[in-house]
């Protein structure tokens, strides 16, 4: 005997109680793929949780996370704090960054600033706790009597080729 | 990779215990601080407690504080987390967490265990 159920589309499931008659999923509910015995249950977002996309017979609803929260997780399953640019949330809650570090996001850690004199070069902007540092020419490019511009070439006496 | 699967939950009447647990994978379990954290109906992440790498240490939230009790198994690379006196406003989804707060590593939580505290 073949089965039914295979018949029936996606958005509809599969009532045994029916003689395998395809039915459409109840109110809330979805399939998402054909050959359904059931329909699954809509997700509810609620709360923290703002819609995205509304469910159909066919797909769930998408959940985000309201303002003030990002989301984490497969399908936005969770929603975690947000804080201000210049702090990192603890367990405790949003806590400024520390001197000689920062955050340009809402999320995330405080990241140290970039050591500048590891390349050789000089801090040309001061961090701050949601900036990092700009690092600019080495301090050696900076001394007195370095000139940064491009010297200029020698003048070449008339007859004479280039060396 | 990093894989933690927490177990233990279900629904309880208030006042009443449950044991959640943990087991990890993927990583040298004995060398991190382990953390739970839950996200009840409708609201935010909250974090519940942590506990160092070796056990002797252990920080809780105010709302379960003297209620809740966490500790590890390093040999079995296993978190716990024993609940009592519980109450409805411990209803949530339970994540066990490599790393607190969890956006900062994207795969390092579980993938939840519901506890539910009803009459």
């Known amino acids: 005997l073949q089965d039914l159920c295979s018949n029936c589309p996606a958005g509809t499931f599969c009532d045994n109680n029916r003689s395998q008659i395809c039915s459409p999923c109840p109110p809330n509910s979805f399939s998402s793929a054909g050959g359904q015995r059931t329909c699954d249950i809509c997700r509810q977002c609620k709360g923290v949780f703002k819609t995205r996309k509304e469910c159909s017979s066919t797909s769930n609803a998408e959940c985000d996370c309201i303002s003030g929260y990002h989301c984490l997780g497969a399908e936005c399953s969770m929603c975690e704090q947000d804080c201000k640019q210049g702090q990192e949330l603890t367990k405790k809650g949003c806590k400024d960054c520390c001197f000689g570090t920062f955050n340009d996001q809402k999320r995330g850690i405080c990241r140290p600033w970039t050591n500048c004199s590891l390349d050789g070069k000089s801090v040309l902007v001061n961090g701050t706790k949601e900036r990092d540092v700009v690092c600019g020419p080495s301090p050696a490019d900076l001394s007195p009597g370095a000139s940064s511009a491009t010297p200029p070439a020698p003048a070449r006496e008339p007859g004479h080729s280039p060396q | 990779q990093v894989q933690l699967v927490e177990s233990g939950g279900g629904l309880v009447h208030p006042g009443g215990s449950l044991r959640l647990s943990c087991a990890a994978s993927g990583f040298i379990f004995s060398l991190y601080t382990m953390s739970w954290v839950r996200q009840a109906p409708g609201k935010g992440l909250e974090w519940v407690s942590d506990?160092?790498?070796?056990?002797?240490?252990?920080d809780y939230a105010d709302s379960v504080k003297g209620r809740f009790t966490i500790s590890r198994d390093n040999a079995k690379s296993t978190l716990y987390l024993q609940m009592n006196s519980l109450k409805p406003e411990d209803t949530a989804v339970y994540y066990c967490?490599?790393?607190?707060?969890?956006?900062?590593?994207?795969?390092?939580w579980g993938q939840g265990t519901q506890v539910t505290v009803s009459s």
């Open positions: 967490a490599k790393d607190y707060p969890l956006g900062q590593r994207e795969d390092y």
């Open positions: 506990i160092n790498s070796g056990g002797d240490s252990t």
